[in-house]
Structures are given as structure tokens and as C-alpha cells.
Interface confidence: medium
């Protein structure tokens, strides 16, 4: 494997070379972590502290902004209830969402009490608005988390916003919510650990199942404890969950509560030496690379280790096939607290627990018409057995030699002369981006990895906690607690002055054109356009 | 017609033991969390403890924690509370009520009570 | 001492309309917890009166009524009857690990 990045550039050689714009926060502000893109727009809207942006894509130092706080009344009841005044008694966002093409939809910790409202942007980008609805705010409960610390994943689609969230002050009663909309609110079950264990959640996508959109499915992505008996002593594990959209949930004891929500874990391991796996189980983010088929798209995960001792990070691949088998496989199940969970062997009732009611795969038309022996079965069977593992069975990268973990993904697929490329941007805890491409060896999947650049992409050592990429503008845009980034996806003119350089780079935004490194454009018609992705051989490409 | 019944209360001097009981019916036992709420006579409620569908979540109100332990057993549509240590001040009515999840989203309300049961604690 | 606050006492005339307050702190009502209310005829078990702070279950007259704002809550009841005559509990939950709390209890007493 090539861990020696090809490029390694520090904040100075970012800034003199023109290569990053950072934004570098307010004095009031904080907490740059929920990002929203938009493209058609050319906007990239930030949630930090007390504040909501909107920034150019083409310069980040173009900026609108939106002040959010909380009144001093409530300010000061966090701080009678023992918060910490700067880093807790404030207005947090941790929800935007596109509401509609003229609204979107904010909701932030309120000072641990979360508080909702909308975001007038406009009709169109030549409107030139970005104003708070000052009129209509709601209850955040269910959307935003009380507590600042506490991850969310949320995705507003058709009038609806599914939020995995703590939906407390303690940050104790975590559940993925369906509110908005015009139907009661949906949530999963309350004080059961077989459900969701103390998760963190990471993200939320719609997939669809099948051409008949009854089929589409919600995935969240977090991880949290390993039930008792699943694991010898205290564990992680990464989960996928799967929701359907039209679940409106169940009758008895499943009235507004989740109906069809299953989950599974997520395997990223090594084989180590003693014959024990090395697992990366702290799930940190995930990216869908949706290609051709919206269907099937490829799930990047990025995953660091839970020990102490050994400090790692990977990156794995999975297939949505390999979760619908997954799915469709055996439940987990256990006769009792003491006993080891085994795959359930009795009769699954009809229509199989998970399966979205459509008249694609089964003649009902409702979750609330489901029999008592389904709502029976799915509220005690909510886990899989079988767990998804990465595609060939392995992680794609791994660091665990470096004073850093991995904490964000983004992935761009570029094509190139020999063939298309996922470009990998992986952000770390120290607030460096690695840029990693992943080369097929034999057969697509099976991967060679190339670390590309290693850029320092802020002043200060600060993680990285969120991250957009712009195919439109071929940038990168990089949020943290002290500030937003912006960078380009490709720096060709650094990799050298000669053609040899530039094709043993290996980057598949970059080509040499005869007299210098540059930009490849796949339907520029340039026979002297020399690269070589699979190989990096410049001998057979560079006649100098 | 959902019923709740308690029984078991009655005289006890302290740091005497009962086991309150309550007998469910007309609705599905199993899928319900439920808990006990009790009142001295002449004051007000107050919550004591509640048991969620599965026995999976179990919490006490900290006058009693440590000394009543709560249990159900869903073959039987019945509820326990197991009483140790009996003080004075744990003379009350004491109420079986199940938690209405359906109605109230977040917190559950108690949508069905039993008549109760009297437990003294005197010497 | 109640977490939650209730005026000891109301009274109104029949046909009156009255109302019961209820007042919590930023760490039960003020944290965004559910509010319910319960009447508790003489003798008899409390019963569900308003759920989710404005929500009625079935068989509850309209004249009750039910709000929310801020750290507080309130139960109003019109066109008082003489059977309206009870002791009404306001509840929800206490952080920090949440639990039920009741308020003290309000004594309605319909004069004449």
C-alpha cells in the first residue's frame, strides 16, 4: 500500500499557493458542523452557533448570515440548570434541511430546548433572500437534540422530517422521529435497548426499493452499545437501520410507533495475526455514491477503532444489495436476558416484518392493517442476525500508524483516460484532508488504494466535522468548530514540470497536455493528453 | 372495558414487607408499560414506579428506591410491587395505572387507573 | 413540596368559567415534557382528563380545555357544573433522569 501522500502541503503552502479560503467564524460564533449544499443556488448554508449561513460556493468569503440566539430568559434557565453558558446556553443548529424551493428548515438546541422555524430563501438565486420566518417557530423536541454534544441525523422529504435524535433534556430517550407533515408523528419504541442501545446517530437517506415509489426506504446510519449477550463486554457496533416511507405506523401496541424499522450491523475488520479480527466499530460518517443507478448506490463508511490502546481508521464499501440480503435474512433472537442471540428458526409471519406495504411485494395497503402477529413479531424482533459485511470482505483504507483518526467522507467519481475513478476526501481529527484514490486491480472491487495529498486545511489542529463536495464548482468545502474551508478537488500544477511527475501522481483530475500539468477533461480531443491511473507508468506515456 | 384491580394492601408495622398486586384485563397486558402511583390520604399523587412492556426499563421514585422492586408477568396480565423495609410515610392508596403511549407522543399520561389498594405502615 | 405548582383552591359560580394553574421550572415543563391533567372525583381513582397539555380523551366534555407556554400550563374549564367538583393534579416529568411529578393538587369547588 502507498501511505506516503504524493502532495503533503501544510496551512502556509495551502494559503501561498491559493489553494484554500478558509472562513475562519465569528467571534460569537461557533460550531460550524451542519452543512446543507446547494447547487443550483450556489449556496452552501452552514448551522453554527447562534448563526446561520449562507455562503458563495465560488468564494466562501461572500456570506450572508441569519443571527439565531436564544432570549436572555432562556439563556438564563440553562444556566440555573447547571449548563455551561458558552458551550451549552445557546442556539445550536443541528438541522437544515431543504423545506420546499423557497424555504428551508432549521431547528437548533435552543439553549436545551430545542426550537424549529423556517429559512426564506427565495424563489429564485437572483432573489437575494436569506431570512429567518421571525413569525413561526416550533417545538424542536424530536428534531433537535436538548444537548449540543449530541449528534443528529436528519432528512426532510415530502413535508416530513426524519431526525434520529435524544428527544430529552438528559439526552437519555434517543429514537428516529417522523414529525412535520400532516400524519400523527411516528417514532421508534420507548425503553427498549433491542431497539437502539445509546446510539449516535450519523445519517439519513432515501433509497428506493423498486420503480414503485410505495417501495422507497429511509436508512439511518449510526452506532451505538452492543446489546448484552451479542458481545463480551462493553462494545460499539455500526449499525444500518431501514425504515419505509409509508409507515404510519402500527395498531396495539406499535400506534405510532415504527412498524417496518429493522437494523443491522455494519462489519469493517482486518483479519489480525492471532487469528482475531481488528473491528472498526466507531462509525464516524458515511457517503452514498449514487451512480447510474439510484437504486443500488455504493455506501462509503468511514470507521475508527474503540480502543484506547490501538488508534485506527478505515474506510469500508458496502453494496445495498448485500444489506437487502441482509434484510431479508434471519432475525436475531433471544429467549431471555442471559441467553446468546441466535438466528430466530420459528415461523416469520405474513407479511415478513420490514417489508413496505405497496402492491409491489404483498397485498396490504397499510402498516396499520398489519396482523397482530406481525405487530408482535416486529416490536420484539427489531435486529437482524446476520450482519452486512464490506464489499471483498475488507476495508478499501486503513491508517493505523499516524497521530490522527478519520472523521468525515466525501467521495467523486471522476473519469479519466483508462477508465472512472472514486476520488475519496477523507477528513480528520486534526484537521487534515487526505485525498485517496481507489484503483481496481483484477475485478472493480477488489482495490488498490493511492494516497493522492495530505492538506492541512486549518490554522489550528481542529476536527473536522462536516464536509460537501461540489461536483459544479470542483470544490471542497470543510466545516470544524473554528471555521468553514473551502479548497479545490485538484492543485495539477503542483505535482511538477514534467510529464513524468504528472502521470506518477495518479490523480484522475490531472493529465499532462504537452506542457504542463493540468486539468483532464475527458472530451477535450488531445492526443498529447498523457495519463496513466491504473499504473502510473510514465514510460509508456511521456515521450520526454 | 380495560379494569385494573389491585390488591394485597393492609396493615403493617415498619420495616415490615407486602406485595401489592394488579390483576389487568381488557386490553393486551403485554404491550403495555405500567406503573404505581400512590397518595397519603389527604395529599396528593405521587409516581412510584414503572416497568416498560418487556421488563426492560424499570425506574423507581427515590423515596423508594432500594426498598420496593417492581415486576410483572405478562402470562398472568398481572403487576407487582414488592414492598421491603415499610416506613410510615409509605402510608398511602396505592394505584396501578398504565401509561397511554398512543395519546401522548413523548410522555406517556396514564390513561387507566385502578381504585387502589390501602397500605398502612403502623406500630 | 410539589415540583409542580397548583393554587391550593379555585371556586366558581355554575356556568362559570375557571381556570387551574400549573407552574413547573426549566427542567419539567420548561424542558419541553408532555403535561397531562387528572380529575379525582371523591373517593373515587384520578382519572385522564387532558393528555399532551391541550389534548382530550374521548368521553371528556369540550368544556375542559387545556394550554402551554413557557414553564407553565393551565387547565380551563367552562360553563362550571355542579359533578366538576374534584381535586385536578397537573403532571409531567423532572430531569435530569426523567420521572412523572404531579403538582400538589387543585381543590375546585362549585359555590351555591
Known amino acids: 500500500k502507498n501511505n506516503v501522500p504524493r502532495l503533503k502541503l501544510s496551512y502556509k503552502e495551502m494559503l501561498e499557493s491559493n489553494n484554500v479560503i478558509t472562513f475562519n467564524g465569528l467571534a460569537n460564533s461557533s460550531s460550524y458542523h451542519t452543512f446543507l449544499l446547494d447547487e443550483e443556488r450556489s449556496r452552501l448554508y452552514v448551522g453554527a452557533k447562534d448563526h446561520i449561513f449562507s455562503f458563495d460556493l465560488v468564494n466562501i468569503k461572500d456570506f450572508q448570515k441569519i443571527v439565531w440566539p436564544v432570549s436572555y430568559t432562556r439563556r438564563d434557565e440553562c444556566k440555573w440548570a447547571g449548563k455551561d453558558i458558552l458551550k451549552e446556553c445557546a442556539n445550536f443548529i443541528k438541522v437544515l434541511k431543504a423545506y420546499n424551493q423557497t424555504h428551508l428548515y432549521a431547528c437548533g438546541t435552543g439553549a436545551f430546548h430545542p426550537i424549529c422555524t423556517y429559512i426564506e430563501i427565495g424563489h429564485h438565486p437572483e432573489d437575494n433572500i436569506f431570512k429567518l420566518e421571525n413569525s413561526h417557530f416550533e417545538n424542536g423536541r424530536g428534531k433537535s437534540p436538548y444537548d449540543p454534544k449530541l449528534l443528529t441525523a436528519s432528512l426532510l422529504i415530502d413535508g416530513e422530517l426524519y431526525s434520529g435524535t435524544a428527544a430529552d433534556f438528559m439526552g437519555r430517550d434517543f429514537a428516529i422521529f417522523r414529525t412535520l407533515g400532516h400524519h400523527h408523528p411516528i417514532r421508534t419504541e420507548q425503553h427498549d435497548s433491542r431497539w437502539l442501545n445509546d446510539p449516535k446517530f450519523i445519517s439519513a437517506h432515501l433509497i428506493s426499493e423498486s420503480d414503485n415509489p410505495e417501495d422507497d426506504k429511509v436508512y439511518f446510519f449510526f452506532r451505538e452499545n452492543a446489546i448484552d449477550g451479542e458481545h463480551s463486554g462493553k462494545a460499539t457496533h455500526a449499525r444500518i437501520g431501514q425504515i419505509c416511507k409509508n409507515d404510519f405506523g402500527g395498531h396495539r401496541s406499535l400506534v405510532n410507533k415504527w412498524t417496518t424499522f429493522l437494523k443491522a450491523r455494519l462489519i469493517c475488520s482486518v483479519p489480525g495475526p492471532n487469528g482475531i479480527d481488528t473491528h472498526f466499530d466507531e462509525l464516524q460518517d458515511v457517503f452514498l455514491m449514487n451512480f447510474k443507478d439510484p437504486k443500488n448506490p455504493v455506501v462509503y463508511g468511514v470507521f475508527t477503532t474503540s480502543s484506547n490502546i490501538f488508534k485506527g481508521s478505515a474506510v469500508c464499501m458496502y453494496s445495498m444489495s448485500d444489506v437487502r440480503r441482509v434484510f431479508l435474512g434471519p432475525y436475531a433472537h433471544r429467549d431471555g436476558p442471559n441467553y446468546q442471540w441466535v438466528p430466530y428458526q420459528g415461523r416469520v409471519p405474513y407479511p415478513r416484518p420490514g417489508t413496505c406495504p405497496s402492491k409491489t411485494f404483498g397485498g396490504f395497503d397499510s402498516t396499520k392493517d398489519l396482523p397482530d402477529d406481525v405487530i408482535t413479531f416486529a416490536r420484539s424482533h427489531p435486529a437482524m442476525y446476520n450482519p452486512v459485511f464490506p464489499m471483498n470482505n475488507r476495508p478499501i483504507v486503513i491508517k493505523t500508524d499516524v497521530n490522527y483518526q478519520f472523521t468525515q467522507i466525501v467521495v467523486d467519481r471522476v473519469d479519466a483516460e483508462d477508465g472512472q475513478y472514486d476520488v475519496m476526501f477523507i477528513g480528520t481529527d486534526v484537521g487534515t484532508v487526505l485525498k485517496v484514490v481507489s484503483i481496481p486491480k483484477e475485478t472493480w472491487y477488489d482495490l488498490e488504494e493511492v494516497l493522492l495529498e495530505e492538506m492541512t486545511v486549518f490554522r489550528e489542529p481542529t476536527a473536522i466535522s462536516a464536509m460537501e463536495l461540489s461536483t459544479k464548482q470542483q470544490q471542497l468545502y470543510i466545516g470544524s468548530t473554528a471555521g468553514v474551508a473551502q479548497l479545490p478537488l485538484h492543485r495539477c500544477d503542483i505535482y511538477g514540470k514534467a510529464c513524468a511527475e504528472c502521470c506518477l501522481a495518479r490523480d484522475p483530475y490531472c493529465a499532462w497536455d504537452g506542457s504542463a500539468c493540468s486539468r483532464y477533461f475527458p472530451t477535450a480531443k488531445r492526443a498529447t493528453r498523457a495519463q496513466d491511473i491504473r499504473n502510473g507508468d510514465p514510460l509508456t506515456h511521456c515521450s520526454d | 372495558e380495560v379494569q385494573l384491580l389491585e390488591s394485597g394492601g393492609g396493615l403493617v408495622q415498619p420495616g415490615g414487607s407486602l406485595r401489592l398486586s394488579c390483576a389487568a384485563s381488557?386490553?393486551?397486558?403485554?404491550?403495555?408499560?405500567m406503573n404505581w402511583v400512590r397518595q397519603a390520604p389527604g395529599k396528593g399523587l405521587e409516581w412510584v414506579s414503572g416497568i416498560s412492556w418487556n421488563s426492560g426499563w424499570i425506574d423507581y421514585a427515590d423515596s423508594v428506591k432500594g426498598r420496593f422492586t417492581i415486576s410483572r408477568d405478562n402470562s398472568k396480565n398481572t403487576l407487582y410491587l414488592q414492598m421491603n423495609s415499610l416506613r410510615a410515610e409509605d402510608t398511602a392508596v396505592y394505584y396501578c395505572?398504565?401509561?397511554?403511549?398512543?395519546?401522548?407522543?413523548?410522555?406517556?399520561?396514564?390513561?387507566?387507573w385502578g381504585q387502589g389498594t390501602l397500605v398502612t405502615v403502623s406500630s | 413540596q410539589s415540583v409542580l405548582t397548583q393554587p391550593p383552591s379555585v371556586s366558581g359560580a355554575p356556568g362559570q368559567r375557571v381556570t387551574i394553574s400549573c407552574t413547573g421550572s426549566?427542567?419539567?415543563?420548561?424542558?419541553?415534557?408532555?403535561v397531562h391533567w387528572y380529575q379525582q372525583l371523591p373517593g373515587t381513582a384520578p382519572k385522564l382528563l387532558i393528555y399532551g397539555a391541550s389534548n382530550r380523551p374521548s368521553g371528556v366534555p369540550d368544556r375542559f380545555s387545556g394550554s402551554k407556554s413557557g414553564t407553565s400550563a393551565s387547565l380551563a374549564i367552562t360553563g362550571l357544573q355542579a359533578e366538576d367538583e374534584a381535586d385536578y393534579y397537573c403532571s409531567s416529568y423532572e430531569g435530569p433522569n426523567p420521572y412523572v411529578v404531579f403538582g400538589g393538587g387543585t381543590k375546585l369547588t362549585v359555590l351555591g
Open positions: 426549566s427542567s419539567n415543563i420548561g424542558a419541553g415534557y408532555d
Open positions: 381488557g386490553f393486551d397486558f403485554s404491550s403495555y408499560e
Open positions: 395505572a398504565r401509561s397511554g403511549y398512543s395519546s401522548s407522543w413523548f410522555d406517556p399520561d396514564f390513561d387507566y
